[in-house]
Each structure stands twice: as C-alpha cells, then as structure tokens.
C-alpha cells in the first residue's frame, strides 16, 4: 500500500499556516518544487535531508518546500497564519494511538503499561541492547519513546528504567478503539484514515486514483480534512475512497461510542413544533406532506421501497410515519402513501425563527453560537472559510476557527456591536445580523465611562442657537442637501465618507441628496471658489440603536484650504469633564433675520451622572452617549444641525466626539445636550471605511 507516490496521504494538512522557529538551533531545509506531493515524497523518504522530517510547509506563491525536523507540537516552534502557506505534519508523529501493531507509531508516550519510565534508546543503562538509532534508521528511536521497530505482536514497547524489568509494552490504544462515532457517524470528525480492511484512505482534496464530487471547498461543513473517514451522504457509517485503484471506497471500522451521546456541538436542536435550520432535529408528529397526503411508515416498504429504515438511521427517530430529515435534505420530508408520489416535503411545519422567542446575545456577542445566517438587510451570509483573508486584514490575532462554522452570524473580531457576517454582495461586503442584546444584559462593552482611561486624541481642530458666526478651520463641516435644501449637518471624516445622523434621510432615493463642502453660507453665497458639490452613492446605517449613518460620497472630496477631514477619537476613550468643545450648524438660530452663516456654540463636557441630574433624573445616559452643557444659557444644537459634530480639543488636536441627533430638546436653558458618543462607535466607523469599497479619485 505505501508506495513512493501518494505519500501526502500520510500528512495532516493545516491550510494557510506555517511554522516559525523560535529556537535558532532548529534546522530547516528548503527547495523549489511544483507541488505539495513532491514535498511529501521527500519528507517521507528523508531523501537528501540532514534530519528526520516530521513536517513540511508548501509555499504556494514561491512554489517552495520547507522541510522541518519538528512539528507544531515541538518546543521552540510556533504556528503562524500565512495566506500562501500550507502546513503538512506527518500523522505518525502527532497520533496518540496505533494502527495494527504500531510499527509506524512515532508519538511521544514514554511510559510502559505498568507505569515504568522508558530507558532512552541511545543509552545502555540499565539494560544493554542492540536497538541503536543508527541501526534502525527511519524507525525514529528517539529519546525514550515507545516504539515497535520490528513490528512485533504486542505493539510499541521500550526498555525500562527499572533494572529488574528489561522491557515492557506500552499501553497505547488502537486508533479503532480511541475513535468512536454516534448514530451513523455523520458528525464524526475523528482521525481514522484507513478502511476496515486496512486500506489507506485517499485525500478528499485529491482526485486520484478515484475521481469524486466531495471537494472540501464545495462542502465546507462536511469535515473533509486530509484523508479521514467521513459520512457526508447519509450512509450507515463513515467511509472513504481508498488508495487502491481497484477498490473505489470502503467503510471504516469505527466503533459506536459507549454512551452513544453526541457532542453538544453536533446535536441538531430538537424541536417538536417547528423547524430549526433544515429540520434535522425535528421530532414532532406532523405526518402529512404540505398538500395533506399522508406519509408512508418509515419501517414499511409499501407503496415505495427504500433504505431509509429505522435500522439504517438509528438516531434519526424514524418512528411511525412522522416527517423527518434523516439525510440532510432542505427540510423534513417523508415517503407518501400515494403510489404516484414517492416523496414530499412537509413544508407546512413553521420555522422556529418565525414562531419562537428571538435569538439574543450577551455582552458584545463574541460567544454567540446561534444559527441565524442573514444580515439585517436580509442578505444570506457567506461561508466564513471563504472570507478568512478579509477577516485577517482587519484583525491581528488568529480567530477561533471552531466558532466560525458554516455561515452563521458570529463576532470573531470582538466588534462592540454584536454578531455580523460577510455577504456575497460587493456593495455590502459585511453587515450586522438582526440580533439584539438579551433583555436585562448589562455587561458593559466599554468600562469607566466617567474616568479618563484612554486618551481620545490622535487628531485636529457645531445648529446653533445664539451661536457666533465662524469661518476658521471648519473645512470638515458638511451641509447635507435634500432636494436642493439644507437638511442636516455632517462631518467629513475621510475623503469619501461623511458621518451624520439617521434622521436626516426622509427618502431612500440617493439622487435626492448632495453634500456641500467648503461652504460658510448655507446657500453657498460667496463660497463659489471653495464649494465642492458631491453626490451620495451609499448610506450605511450604524449598529443597532446608534442613530448614526456613514454617507459614502460618489467621488472623493478634494482636500484643500477650504475642505479638510476631521479626526475620530480612539475607540472607547473618555474626554475629561469640563473639556471645552463646540457644536457647529446652519440650523434654526433663534434670530428673525437669520443670515444663513455657519454658527458655533461653545459647550463643555459633563459627566453622565451629572448630566442626568441636570435632566432631573428623567434621562439615563448609557455608554453610547456623551453630554455637553452650554456656557451661555440657551446656546446649543437644534433642527437643521442634526448630523453635525460636537468637536473637542485634546493635546492640541481637534476631533469629532459627538453627533447631534434629535430627541433631547432644543437649546433648553440649563439642560445640557446629549450626543451620540463617537468614541463608542469608532471601531465600527474604521471597519466600514476599511472594508466598503470607495471610488478612486
């Protein structure tokens, strides 16, 4: 069986992974090659390598092999993500069980059956012997690890460190004993890689010697790793294609687990009144198909013969004639009692998403493991494994791949605003899922609101009742026009992006809107030389409850003496109380002869508790809000200023700390204004800017 070709089947593959040696003494050998198979052949034969090859990396970009005398479990080594790399580790060195007599066992067990420590193979104390590593090349007589260099009956053994006991076998289980499955093994994700007759399995990502349809990339949820036995198609038990050209496939000898219970992660949620997902866990008693035709009993072969029997599908609850989904179909079904209609779906069973309590998440949803897979716009989420490159572009750690299954809404980047997913739509690369925080969950996503922990500054220098006219350094101020009239303010935070409020968009027709930049007069009088008029190409509503909108411009603004961007604060930062800030706007000003000039009102930051007191305790501020009070009675934001910024200065840098939104009263004496706290949403803003495509200038 173990011919010179196809040795890649003896390796465990970890895609997009390489090994970095921390210990400089560790050796590496490299060479240009065409395929990973060539690397594998050389590693297996140790041909021309000055060490015993335990693993290799294939660099797909450079078409290069890196052979290692170590693997990911060795000390002095760490795993690292890399798009162009695939790591292959020889299974013999990472297995903790034996196949047959254990001749190929190269694991690290070094204690005998009775618990005696093994004697190192290179030592003659306490027992002299002829099993020298130099005499048994390729048998890996390393350290004091249990081995079976001659393939003797009892399995791996060693000389012991007890002078009274010359040698003893080690208690290493058979892989077929360690490996077990539940039901028919559809959820089996173990490491059995040979069939019941001992044939080595063909890798799922190979098409030789047998061509097949079960490509790992086409079925990402079926666990088609390396050449391990799987049951992707509802067979009675796991199987694999074999390396024997004359035997296409064979079952694998995997015993049923003693208690026959599934892992929590594998159990389809059992429901009796509705369908969750595809309804594999439906255990109700509906027994007609959608149009009322009764179902045939599963244990009957009349009027339709079939092999979907209770005996063949032990854990699928094929009782009576109830609708079930034993084979991963799109929903529960049954054979019908009408001889002319073989099968029918029971699509009259309602969907649990529609009829049961809503999904929710705690904290920021990083541990959410529900199975919602749509965005808030109804787009179907795309598979996580198709988007890992994009994910790595905006996070700096290895995401927990065990959580990123299928295309379910998840939060792998610790987003403050809950689960999200990638979509297949280039206009909307990713979006949040319509899941809310659980009722009563008070876990803060940012702590210490009223104590300066993180500095806000990294950056530059807002409708304003009784404010004074302003002209200097307000190039980031945007007048949002709706059907040729000023409707709201906004802040230019990037050449193609304006931060504003969600109440500013009475129509969804983007042709109704324009952004005017570089102006001082709301009608643009006298601003002709400096004015830029830009169309709007997209609106991205903020996370749940934010009242923010990021408005994408149809083309980037040209930054000059009159148009500039304003910086964002650091995420989760707190600005000290009494910091002097300003609000800007063109809204209603309280003056009868309003001149249409941009106004500024000076405010100072107020802590959330004190702010609540000023509102007579009627308002409780949360972590997404910031409060600023007027130095001058009745000075502050009002209609027409919505969307505009609360600008503060810290360390000689001006930044947008708040956004004006309706709902908190208009310049009421002794009532400080409450704004959307931009620092709370800074990560969301950066993520949108980073991931949503913008036109090039």
């Amino acid at each position: 069986q173990r011919k010179r070709r196809n040795t890649i089947h003896e390796f465990k593959k970890s895609a997009k992974t390489t090994l970095i040696k921390i210990d400089p003494a560790l050796k590496i050998k490299t060479k240009k090659v065409n395929t990973a198979d060539q690397c594998a052949n050389r590693c297996t034969r140790n041909k021309g390598l000055p060490f015993t090859c335990k693993a290799f990396v294939f660099d797909k970009a450079r078409k290069q092999c890196l052979w290692f005398p170590f693997n990911s479990m060795s000390s002095g080594v760490k795993k690292e993500f890399g798009h162009e790399f695939d790591l292959y580790e020889n299974k013999d060195y990472i297995r903790n069980c034996i196949i047959g007599k254990g001749r190929s066992y190269k694991g690290t067990v070094s204690i005998t059956k009775s618990g005696i420590k093994c004697q190192p193979w290179s030592s003659m104390i306490p027992h002299e012997h002829s099993f020298l590593p130099s005499s048994y090349r390729g048998k890996d007589l390393q350290e004091n690890y249990c081995r079976n260099p001659r393939g003797e009956e009892g399995g791996p053994w060693c000389f012991t460190s007890n002078p009274e006991v010359r040698y003893e076998v080690c208690d290493i289980p058979q892989c077929s004993e360690v490996e077990c499955m539940t039901c028919n093994g559809e959820s089996y994700r173990g490491l059995m890689d040979h069939t019941e007759s001992g044939k080595i399995c063909q890798r799922w990502d190979h098409q030789t010697p047998h061509r097949h349809k079960f490509l790992p990339e086409r079925y990402p949820d079926k666990g088609f790793d390396d050449n391990y036995c799987r049951n992707p198609d509802g067979q009675p038990r796991p199987w694999c294609y074999t390396l024997d050209p004359h035997t296409r496939w064979e079952y694998c000898a995997i015993k049923t687990c003693a208690d026959n219970t599934m892992n929590d992660t594998d159990v389809p949620l059992e429901t009796t009144e509705c369908i969750q997902g595809q309804g594999e866990g439906y255990r109700g008693t509906v027994n007609t198909i959608w149009n009322g035709i009764p179902c045939q009993r599963w244990d009957s072969q009349y009027p339709h013969e079939h092999d979907m029997t209770p005996e063949n599908f032990k854990c699928k609850d094929l009782r009576e004639n109830y609708c079930r989904n034993p084979d991963g179909s799109e929903s529960p079904w049954c054979f019908t009692t009408d001889p002319n209609i073989r099968v029918g779906y029971c699509s009259q069973i309602p969907n649990c998403d529609m009829s049961h309590g809503q999904d929710c998440y705690r904290g920021n949803g990083k541990n959410y493991m529900g199975n919602l897979s749509q965005t808030r716009s109804g787009l179907t989420c795309s598979m996580w494994d198709k988007n890992m490159e994009d994910l790595h572009r905006h996070i700096f750690w290895e995401p927990d791949a065990s959580k990123l299954n299928e295309n379910y809404c998840r939060n792998p980047d610790d987003d403050a605003h809950g689960p999200w997913c990638y979509t297949g739509n280039p206009l909307i690369p990713w979006d949040y899922c319509p899941i809310s925080r659980c009722e009563g969950d008070t876990t803060p996503t940012i702590v210490n609101l009223d104590h300066p922990v993180i500095s806000c500054a990294k950056t530059k220098q807002l409708r304003v009742v009784n404010g004074i006219p302003t002209r200097t350094n307000i190039g980031w101020m945007v007048s949002l026009r709706y059907r040729n009239k000023h409707i709201c303010g906004g802040s230019l935070i990037k050449e193609s992006w304006v931060l504003t409020a969600r109440q500013c968009f009475p129509s969804r027709d983007l042709k109704d809107y324009e952004a005017w930049l570089g102006i001082h007069d709301v009608h643009g009088r006298g601003d002709e030389k400096c004015k830029q008029v830009l169309n709007v190409s997209q609106l991205v509503y903020g996370p749940e409850g934010s009242d923010l909108v990021l408005m994408k411009l149809a083309r980037p603004a040209v930054l000059d003496d009159f148009v500039s961007t304003i910086d964002l604060p650091n995420y989760g930062c707190t600005i000290p109380e009494k910091t002097s800030c300003s609000v800007y706007g063109w809204g209603y000003t309280g003056l009868i002869n309003y001149d249409g000039l941009l106004r500024v009102a000076h405010l100072y930051i107020m802590g959330n508790e004190k702010c609540s007191q000023h509102h007579r305790g009627k308002v409780t501020l949360n972590e997404s809000e910031i409060c600023a009070g007027a130095e001058k009675i009745g000075s502050g934001p009002c209609e027409g200023d919505y969307g505009g910024p609360l600008v503060c200065e810290q360390h000689k840098m001006r930044m947008v700390l708040g956004v004006i939104v309706p709902g908190r009263g208009c310049a009421i004496p002794n009532r400080p204004g409450i704004f959307v706290r931009v620092a709370y949403y800074a990560k969301w803003i950066h993520k949108i800017i980073l991931t949503y495509k913008v036109p090039q200038s």
């Epitope: 969907n351 998403d353 529609m354 309590g357 809503q358 999904d359 919602l372 749509q374 808030r376 716009s377 109804g378 787009l379 179907t380 979509t423 297949g424 739509n425 206009l427 909307i428 979006d431 949040y432 899922c433 319509p434 899941i435 809310s436 009722e439 969600r502 109440q503 968009f505 129509s507 969804r508 983007l510 190409s537 997209q538 609106l539 991205v540 509503y541 903020g542 749940e544 409850g545 309706p662 709902g663």
Partner: antibody
Framework: EVQLVESGGGLVQPGGSLRLSCAAS????????MSWVRQAPGKGLEWVGA???????YYTNSAKGRFTISRDNSKNTLYLQMNSLRAEDTAVYYC????????????????WGQGTLVTVSS | DIQMTQSPSSVSASVGDRVTITCQSS???????LSWYQQKPGKAPKLLIY???SLASGVPSRFSGSGSGTDFTLTISSLQPEDFATYYC??????????FGGGTKVEIK
C-alpha cells in the same frame, strides 16, 4: 416615474394556482428587497413574504410551502406563485419595495403598488 | 407568532384634535425599525414614519413617532381633514420577518 404595477389577480378555485407579477419602473428590482403584502376584504395588512437584495426568500408561516417568490431581473419584475389556494387567501395583494443596497441596514416599505385582487372561491 | 397590538382599533376625533395611536409588539423590534403607514379606502398604504421617529419624505410635520423596544406611538398633533384614514404600524424582526399591527381607523366625530 418610480412605480410598481401588480397584475395577475382574478378568480380561482380552492386548490388552484395563480401567479402574480409586479413590474417595477424607475428603479432596479435587483438592488432592492421586495415584499408581498396582502389585505383581506375589510381587514388589516398582512406581510406574506419577501425576496431580499440577494434573492433570498422569506415567508410568513401561512405562505410557507404554498407560495414562492421569485424575480426576473432582466424584466425588472417580481413574482408571487401561489399554489393550493384556500378561501382565506382571498385578498388584495400589494407589492412593496423594502430594503435597498444603497442604504445598508434600513427596513421599511417606501413604495407600494396599487394592488391586485385575488378571489378564491368555488 | 409575533403579535403586533395596535390601539385603539378606532378613534373618533375632530379637526384640530391631537390623536395618539400606540403599537405594542410581543417581541422586541430590531434596531427600532418600526414604521407607520396611512391607508385611505381603495388606495395603497403610504409611508409616514420610519425608524420609529423619522419623518418620511413629503409627510407634514404634524405627524411624529416615538418609542423603542416593544412600545411605539404615532402622534398627529393637530388633525386635518385629509388625515381621516386607517393607520398601520409595521415592525422588522430577526430572521427577516415583518409584522403589521391590526390598524387604527381615525374617523370624523
């Protein structure tokens, strides 16, 4: 002019089928989520189902398994295929524009057709 | 199933009156995506308010919306003759589901 025009309604027997069409003009159906909403005589509005921006379909419990929403982007038209019709499906069926790819994360119906009457009776 | 309870089911009022209609959902409405529609006999519904409190295009400022979570309100500050109609609320929920309230008929006193 931006508008939606429904057609295909009429009298049908219980158990029968009908296909409603909703022709859009002035905007592209493929960039929008589109819904069907019905109103039984003298009663309130009831959401039937939707085809989202990417064509994923969603249905209310009473429509699941019997109704199918589809769209033909080349004809800028939305369809509602109704099978196994029952007397309680008698209603005016409206087509409504929902989500829009240009406005990410907004969910409401800003444009409605004039409706088409479906009567299920023997 | 999700229940949207609108009250009152009908209200008799005079021109100039302030009218308040409430809408209560059995489940939390995602991101306060609650909208209000006006429907006149034989006509299609017309959008008035979106996102609980934002006024739709061309809608007079006498209409206003408020509320969050499960409880929402539509207020007509000074009823005009053209406002006599039936009003519906609609909520958006997880799983891409919409649900309408039963409607409130505003009649002339």
């Amino acid at each position: 002019e931006v508008q939606l025009v429904e057609s295909g309604g009429g009298l049908v027997q219980p158990g029968g089928s009908l296909r409603l069409s909703c022709a859009a003009s002035g905007f592209t159906v493929s960039s929008n989520g589109m819904s069907w909403v019905r109103q039984a005589p003298g009663k309130g509005l009831e959401w039937v189902g939707a085809s989202s921006i990417d064509g994923t379909t969603y249905y209310t419990n009473s429509a699941k398994g019997r109704f199918t929403i589809s769209r033909d982007n080349s004809k800028n038209t939305l369809y509602l295929q109704m099978n196994s019709l029952r007397a309680e499906d008698t209603a005016v069926y409206y087509c409504a524009r929902g989500e829009y790819a240009g406005v990410v994360g907004s969910n409401y119906f800003d444009l409605w057709g004039q409706g088409t009457l479906v009567t299920v009776s023997s | 199933d999700i229940q949207m309870t609108q009250s009152p089911s009908s209200v008799s009022a005079s021109v100039g009156d302030r009218v308040t209609i409430t809408c209560q959902s059995s489940q939390r409405i995602y991101s306060n995506w609650l909208s209000w529609y006006q429907q006149k006999p034989g006509k299609a519904p017309k959008l008035l308010i979106y996102a609980a409190s934002s006024l739709a295009s061309g809608v007079p400022s006498r209409f206003s919306g408020s509320g969050s979570g499960t409880d929402f309100t539509l207020t007509i500050s000074s009823l005009q003759p053209e406002d006599f109609a039936t009003y519906y609320c609609a909520g958006y929920y997880s799983g891409h589901i919409y649900s309408f309230g039963g409607g409130t008929k505003v009649e002339i006193k």
